[in-house]
């Protein structure tokens, strides 16, 4: 009883999850030997989704510190009751603590709505910034493959850095710095381009701070279907925030009468958001939500982590899986489009382009589309792993690769569609779409289940990275690159315009299985390698610096 | 040396058309952004339209007052620039000037770095 | 549109004087104008590009200051070769727009 009390008082988290932590830690008293009264032992009474006895939760506004513990046979702490360092101290009030990871979840969150709304903002007013600086296709391609190259380069530095360091001052600080060069780039002058092109590179490198750092904290704050949850409502934020970013540009350019303004907006709001990470989001130790606490300590060098993801199969699996699904999403953003403005322009629906932005109506339903179905595939696909968790241990992948499959279907059914309607069309889109989006959340998840906590940033960025290199760095050149390849051997009219670039675009669905495949090979490795994580996380709390992991 | 010759001017009646033609030489064509910039007898310099390159889908732009009327084009293998000018007014009556606007290869300059020595077109009943 | 004032109409100067042409915006246009010269029965040239930046091949007497709405073109000890039209552009938002020019006569 002094026990499921003691993890209430610290978390206030589901009742599932607080019996599937008080389980674990009867059966890691148990391996151990540990003395000490009921279920709390030598660990303490970590409640599931929350920190372990003896860690100090720190905010700006305070810290919570909870009874220390030492190794079994040192003295440790009677029962649960938590100690404070300080005379006078109390226990923490449960349901404020479950309230403050809840906000700390919701502000990094909304931090990633505002990673996304600044790298969107920039894309809805791409035409007016090309228009301004007399950038040519080439240049606004080079802006675009700056970001990407420096997110890719900086996201496995961020990973490093946030296994080691105080991973909430690097997000702020991420912030911070992303938000004053996109303020600064609103004020470049017309002359310098390659200022503008230094600023999305720049840009570029504060946003991997936050994409790599920011899952793994919301990773040590909760467990099971909770983080599920919470990364769902983190990565519905990249629909949302893009969506946003679009609306955010073109409504504040036309109140503004000036593009310029578009750049101004997020800066402030990052500046907000970055204030609120320092004061809210606690400063978590790695493996928080495990129960580890204090205990676990990075005792690994880059190197070897490296060695060691690489040597996960269920890891490297779902990171070409992500490659596979952010390979389409990227060609499918680019190209889209302009598809359906051709199959209009067959249909003899709508004229033939001369003076772009051509098919500007379809990019906006297309916009709002995906919007809608990111959000939509989020929620189906984390209540989609909820359920099946009931029926196999494998069901995250699972999920996955049959979100994967079905998403190839429909994505290849938008090319047979669109020859004879472009409703249809955009119905297999959606659906698409929508399967497509549905392993977002999961994903992220399974990187939780399969990387221990002193590795996640590490395995974050690095799956960041390949899903670029692999994914939507080169896959809307590569279709451009078919497509006219297609065109250069046939005759030119509006027919094969349509055609050449829907052939090329047949390539994704193939990607797509390829994905699902990954998947499925990620589901069978999965249940090993998530109890080998969880073994070598016992292991890492164990008393002996020696362990090798 | 960059060398821009206009072409095609002359005297022409309200309401007709006339097609202006530059022949350009000393660059590279098919990259460089493009314009026709005109100036009435005694007055000052105004800006007719402004082609881009392939690499910007030959996008053109348009001042107001010839928009719907006038249409810029190019022959990227003739190195060629042309302005189709229809339904004339005396308004129209101008020297017009092919201009090239300096590039750098992944952006271009707005303004004019080199300028042809102008034709004549004279609209008058 | 943006519109662009010249001032004044037309100066009139002794050689080896130094003189200030003055451009106007309607509205701020950071650093995106451009200053031309216009001989009589010539073509325009391009002086300064982007309010301050120096042409390769135009003597070092011409230079350009400004930002926002105010532009100034600065002759420095005006010789005979200088009198001529000398017209703004801003290239800050389409369409281009000229200013109306001011004429460098001899006094």
């Known amino acids: 009883m002094m026990c499921l009390e003691c993890a209430s008082a610290a978390a206030g988290g589901a009742e599932e999850e607080e019996a599937d932590a008080e389980r674990r830690r009867r059966r890691r008293g148990a391996q151990r030997g540990a003395g000490g009264s009921g279920c709390c032992g030598a660990r303490g009474a970590g409640g599931a989704g929350v920190s372990a006895a003896g860690d100090e939760v720190q905010t700006l506004s305070g810290s919570v510190r909870r009874a220390p513990t030492g190794p079994p046979g040192t003295p440790g702490t009677p029962g649960c009751a938590a100690t404070a360092k300080g005379p006078g101290a109390q226990q923490p009030k449960p349901a404020s603590l479950g309230r403050g990871r809840g906000a700390a979840a919701a502000i990094l969150s909304l931090g990633n709505v505002l990673n996304y709304l600044d790298r969107y903002t920039v894309a809805g007013v791409l035409l007016d910034i090309q228009q301004h600086f007399g950038v040519k296709d080439r240049g606004a391609g080079l802006l675009q493959s700056v970001f990407i190259c420096s997110f890719m380069v900086a996201a496995p530095i961020f990973g490093y850095l946030g296994d080691r360091f105080n991973r909430k001052v690097i997000l702020s600080c991420g912030i911070f710095f992303w938000s004053a060069v996109t303020f600064s780039s609103s004020f470049i002058p017309q002359q310098y381009f390659w200022a503008l092109v230094l600023s999305r590179g720049l840009v570029g490198i504060g946003e991997a701070s936050y994409s790599t750092i920011a899952p793994t904290i919301i990773g040590d704050l909760f467990t099971k279907n909770t983080r599920t949850l919470m990364l769902s409502v983190f990565y519905f934020a990249i629909p949302l925030g893009s969506g946003l970013g679009y609306i955010t540009g073109s409504s504040v350019k036309q109140a503004a009468g000036d593009w310029h303004w578009a750049l101004r907006v997020s800066p402030v709001l990052g500046m907000i958001t970055g204030t609120l990470i320092l004061i809210l989001v606690p400063a978590t130790k790695r493996g928080h939500a495990d129960q580890l606490g204090d205990q676990l300590k990075a005792r690994t060098s880059w190197l070897r982590d490296m060695k060691a993801l690489i040597r996960n199969r269920s890891y490297v699996f779902s990171s070409l899986a992500t490659s596979a699904v952010s390979f389409a999403t990227g060609a499918l953003g680019m190209w889209i489009p302009l598809y359906l403005h051709r199959a209009q322009v067959v249909q003899k629906t709508a004229e033939t382009c001369n003076s772009p932005p051509c098919g500007a109506k379809d990019s906006l339903i297309f916009g709002a589309i995906t919007c809608f179905t990111g959000f939509l595939g989020v929620v189906t696909g984390a209540g989609a792993t909820r359920w099946c968790r009931l029926k196999t241990q494998r069901a995250d992948p699972l999920v996955c690769a049959v979100g994967m499959l079905g998403s190839a279907i429909f994505i290849c059914l938008i090319f047979v569609a669109a020859k004879s309607s472009i409703v249809g069309a955009y119905i297999c889109i959606f659906v698409g779409e929508t399967l497509l989006f549905s392993n977002w959340a999961i994903t992220a998840d399974i990187l939780m289940y399969v990387v221990i906590p002193t590795r996640r940033a590490t395995a974050v960025a690095l799956q960041s990275f390949t899903s670029h290199l692999l994914g939507d760095a080169g896959s809307p050149y590569l279709i451009g690159f078919i497509s006219d390849l297609i065109r250069q051997s046939t005759k030119d009219s509006p027919l094969w315009e349509f055609l050449s670039l829907g052939y090329a675009l047949m390539l994704c669905p193939f990607v797509v299985v390829l994905g699902g495949m990954f998947f499925l090979a990620t589901a069978l490795f999965f249940v090993s390698d998530r109890a080998r994580a969880e073994q070598q996380v016992n292991q890492l709390a164990m008393p002996p610096a020696s362990v090798k992991v | 040396e960059v060398q821009l010759v206009e072409t095609g001017g002359g005297l022409v009646r309200p309401g007709s058309s006339l097609k202006l033609s530059c022949a350009t030489s000393?660059?590279?064509?098919?990259?460089?952004?493009m314009s026709w910039v005109r100036q009435a007898p005694g007055k000052g310099l105004e800006w007719v339209a402004l082609?881009?390159?392939?690499?910007?889908?030959?996008?053109?732009n348009y001042a107001e007052s010839i928009k719907g009327r006038f249409t810029i084009s190019r022959d990227d293998s003739k190195s060629r620039v042309y302005l189709q000018m229809n339904t004339l007014r005396d308004q129209d009556t101008a020297t017009y000037y092919c201009?090239?606007?300096?590039?750098?290869?992944?952006?271009?300059?707005?303004?004019?770095?080199?300028w042809g020595q102008g034709v004549m077109v004279t609209v008058s009943s | 549109d943006i519109v662009l004032t010249q001032s004044p109409p037309t100066l009139s100067v002794t050689p080896g004087e130094s003189v200030s042409l003055s451009c106007r915006a309607s509205?701020?246009?950071?650093?995106?104008i451009h200053w031309y010269q216009q001989r009589s029965n010539e073509s325009p040239r391009l002086l300064i590009k982007?309010?301050?930046q120096s042409i390769a091949g135009i003597p070092s007497r011409f230079s350009g200051s400004g930002s926002g709405t105010d532009f100034i073109l600065s002759i420095n000890r005006v010789e005979s070769e200088d009198f001529s039209v000398y017209y703004c552009?801003?290239?800050?938002?389409?369409?281009?727009?000229f200013g109306p020019g001011t004429k460098l006569e001899v006094k």
């Open positions: 201009t090239r606007h300096e590039d750098f290869y992944y952006y271009s300059g707005y303004y004019f770095d080199y």
């Open positions: 000393g660059f590279t064509f098919s990259d460089t952004w």
């Open positions: 082609i881009k390159d392939k690499n910007s889908n030959s996008e053109a």
């Open positions: 509205q701020g246009i950071s650093t995106s």
């Open positions: 982007y309010a301050s």
């Open positions: 552009q801003q290239t800050y938002s389409l369409p281009l727009t």
